[in-house]
């Protein structure tokens, strides 16, 4: 028997990916444990094992079927098990009625690129990837740079309220090397939540012209 | 401004067969779903059929083997094959859309036709 509370949470991608994580504070420490998904409506169900990712918490994704296949709709409710075995039996640890359309966190940001750099400023691209069709251009954007001497959780955030996939960071010190990050987060959902970060594109601006003001 | 228009009601006996059609115009959205409800006096809407996205129907209990549920969600159009009735049938037949517009998603309604099955 497993004491202790136990968090369940699970986030649709808005195309072909259910992410869980589970926690236990009791924590099983050599068990096996899955999440099934038996959507209500559909012909399919999909199983994951749930691998750590601390002492007391797993992680897995549900692949629905190729990535930018639209899986799930806003009247699909998928049940969602957490299972592990206890013997020759699964138990199950954790149960919820999932809605996919309420519970959105797109992937992160792909193909960070530098445009252009000057002395004093940036522009840089991105990607979107697998976000729905349903959304068309009704997106928003967080970005952040890290500045040198400062940590992330310093760096102030710029908001993008509409599916520009771009920015151009100004007022920015010659020669300086920066590190530029962006997310994503649609605007349906109730307990909806921002992208994961992406992965930090490394910049350095243009030296300043010698004998020039700047 | 989304309207949904729906046709096809009427009064039949016992056995016979209906067809409701309804179709969805209007500004800018995606239909992710569209379907059947029915309500007879004093009771709550309750849903007959409908279909979403990737081709998954639902059908009512009551209604399985004798309805069809058909989508065209190039033409935003949804109709309901009905056949064998009986009078528990009858009620009023809304049409209903999920529609995804300027990234939100919303229910939208019809009118209602009436269904009246007679013994």
């Known amino acids: 028997a497993v004491n202790g509370t136990s968090q369940f949470t699970c986030f649709y991608n808005s195309r072909a990916n259910i992410s869980c994580v589970w926690s236990q504070d009791g924590a099983l420490q050599d068990t096996s444990c899955q999440v099934h998904a038996w959507p209500d409506r559909r012909r399919w169900n999909q199983t994951c094992e749930l691998l750590p990712v601390s002492q007391a918490s797993w992680a897995c994704n549900l692949i629905l079927g190729a990535p930018d296949s639209q899986k799930l709709t806003t009247v699909d409710i998928v049940t969602l098990r957490v299972l592990c075995r206890e013997g020759v039996r699964w138990r199950v640890m954790a149960i919820q009625d999932f809605k996919p359309f309420e519970n959105l966190r797109l992937m992160a940001p792909i193909s960070l690129q530098v445009v252009h750099v000057e002395t004093h400023r940036c522009n840089i691209s991105w990607e979107i990837s697998q976000a729905s069709h349903y959304f068309e251009r009704h997106l928003e954007f967080e970005a952040r740079t890290l500045s040198p001497g400062h940590t992330w959780e310093e760096a102030p955030l710029l908001t993008l309220k509409q599916k520009q996939e771009w920015i151009c960071l100004e007022t920015l010190t010659p020669d300086t090397q920066y590190e530029f990050q962006v997310r994503v987060k649609p605007l349906q959902g109730e307990f909806t939540t921002w992208s994961p970060w992406s992965q930090p594109l490394a910049f350095r601006t243009k030296p300043a012209a010698l004998g020039k003001d700047t | 401004q989304v309207q949904l228009v729906e046709s096809g009601g009427g009064s039949v006996q016992t056995g016979g067969s209906l067809r409701l059609s309804c179709v969805v115009s209007?500004?800018?959205?995606?239909?992710?779903?569209m379907g059947w409800y029915r309500q007879v006096p004093g009771k709550q809407r309750e849903l007959v059929a409908d279909?979403?996205?990737?081709?998954?129907?639902k059908y009512a209990d009551s209604v399985k083997g004798r309805f069809t549920i058909l989508r065209d969600s190039v033409k935003n159009t949804v109709t309901l094959q009905m056949s064998s009735l009986n009078p528990e049938d009858t009620g009023v037949y809304y049409c209903?859309?999920?529609?995804?517009?300027?990234?939100?998603?919303?229910?939208?309604w019809g009118q209602g036709t009436q269904v009246t099955v007679t013994s």
């Open positions: 279909m979403a996205d990737g081709g998954s129907a």
């Open positions: 209903k859309a999920g529609l995804w517009i300027t990234g939100r998603h919303s229910d939208y």
């Open positions: 209007g500004s800018h959205f995606i239909s992710d779903v």
